[in-house]
Amino acid sequence: TPEVWVQVQMEATELSSFTVHCGFLGPGSISLVTVSWGGPDGAGGTKLAVLHPELGTRQWAPARQARWETQSSISLALEDSGASSPFANTTFCCKFASFPEGSWESCGSLPPSSDPGLSAPPTPVPILRAD
């Protein structure tokens, strides 16, 4: 069964910078990745970035940089502008569209007691939704 993992970390050098890492564990070819915050894509969440394996990447503020890390994982750097975007209390969701499995989405947030720049290694988390 495909799984999606999400990891959120605060950068050690810049406490206002956060990075969301997401990965897909499954047999299919990824056709699109969508990252949103505040909830799942299309269910109250606001789109931050989309990554397409042939058309490239696109992101919207406060996302600063969306990149593929491997063929099955991505990273999204975010710039926290202060109280208006309290990333520390925000849920980030990653949705992987894969052929032939369909869409798989999972969410995560910054661990409450996380030290800057430190986080647990990416591990699969329960899938919230499969379309």
Epitope: L25, R67, T70, Q71, S72
Partner: antibody, heavy 118, light 107 residues
Framework: EVQLQQSGAELVKPGASVKLSCTAS????????MHWLKQRPEQGLEWIGR????????EYDPRFRGKATLTADTSSNIAYLQLSSLTSEDTAVYYC???????????WGQGTTLTVSS | GIVMTQTPKFLLVSAGDRVTITCKAS??????VVWYQQKPGQSPKLLIS???NRYTGVPDRFTGSGYGTDFTFSISTVQAEDLAVYFC?????????FGGGTKLEIK
């Protein structure tokens, strides 16, 4: 037009160090990860490591730790590979390649030939 | 790291022949395998991503398949310009690793 232009061939003596460059044009290196690879004559490709030019964080194949150092100058859009304590085993063609806008190495440099000989 | 064992090392074929190259990973890499073509004196060029997705502009005589540990790359009708070395590569986990390459020569 996207291009990765690598520095010219090098002939260096054993024990010396060398710094190879990879100048990017047509895109900003802060938008990608820059990877470096080694290819010896009639042998396969070996992954040396990659650098995130935005923060200088780099990751290496364990075989190249202590041998290779990756750096980047985002103001001039150049990535560097420094190799130290050179031996004949380091004689090879070295490639830079970009990854990140797409999930594969879509552009490669033309390669830099390094010859280590006394 | 994950070892990618590629066979055969050499292929001597005639134009029009079908060729198949295999790559076996030492552990599952899902579909995170790519295939490259390297012509003499040139840099490698991407042919296949996600084990089976043909890259833009790559002729449809080049195909890839596989999942997990066993992967196959084929050229349905070899042409003279296919003279090259072909490599598989995994980027499922660091360090990224390559197969040893298959040198394709045309009779």
């Amino acid at each position: 037009e996207v291009q990765l232009q690598q520095s010219g061939a090098e002939l260096v003596k054993p024990g010396a160090s060398v710094k190879l460059s990879c100048t990017a044009s047509g895109f900003n290196i802060k938008d990608i990860y820059m990877h470096w690879l080694k290819q010896r004559p009639e042998q396969g490709l070996e992954w040396i490591g990659r650098i995130d030019p935005t923060n200088g964080n780099s990751e290496y194949d364990p075989r190249f730790r202590g041998k290779a150092t990756l750096t980047a100058d985002t103001s001039s859009n150049i990535a560097y590979l420094q190799l130290s304590s050179l031996t004949s085993e380091d004689t090879a063609v070295y490639y830079c390649a970009r990854f990140g806008i797409y999930p594969y190495f879509d552009y490669w440099g033309q390669g830099t030939t390094l010859t280590v000989s006394s | 790291g994950i070892v990618m064992t590629q066979t055969p090392k050499f292929l001597l074929v005639s134009a029009g022949d079908r060729v198949t190259i295999t790559c076996k990973a030492s552990q599952s890499v899902n579909k995170a395998v790519v295939w490259y073509q390297q012509k003499p004196g040139q840099s490698p060029k991407l042919l296949i991503s996600y084990a089976s997705n043909r890259y833009t502009g790559v002729p449809d005589r080049f195909t890839g398949s596989g999942y997990g540990t066993d992967f196959t790359f084929s050229i349905s009708t070899v042409q003279a310009e296919d003279l090259a070395v072909y490599f598989c590569q995994q980027d499922y986990s660091s360090p990224w690793t390559f197969g040893g390459g298959t040198k394709l020569e045309i009779k």
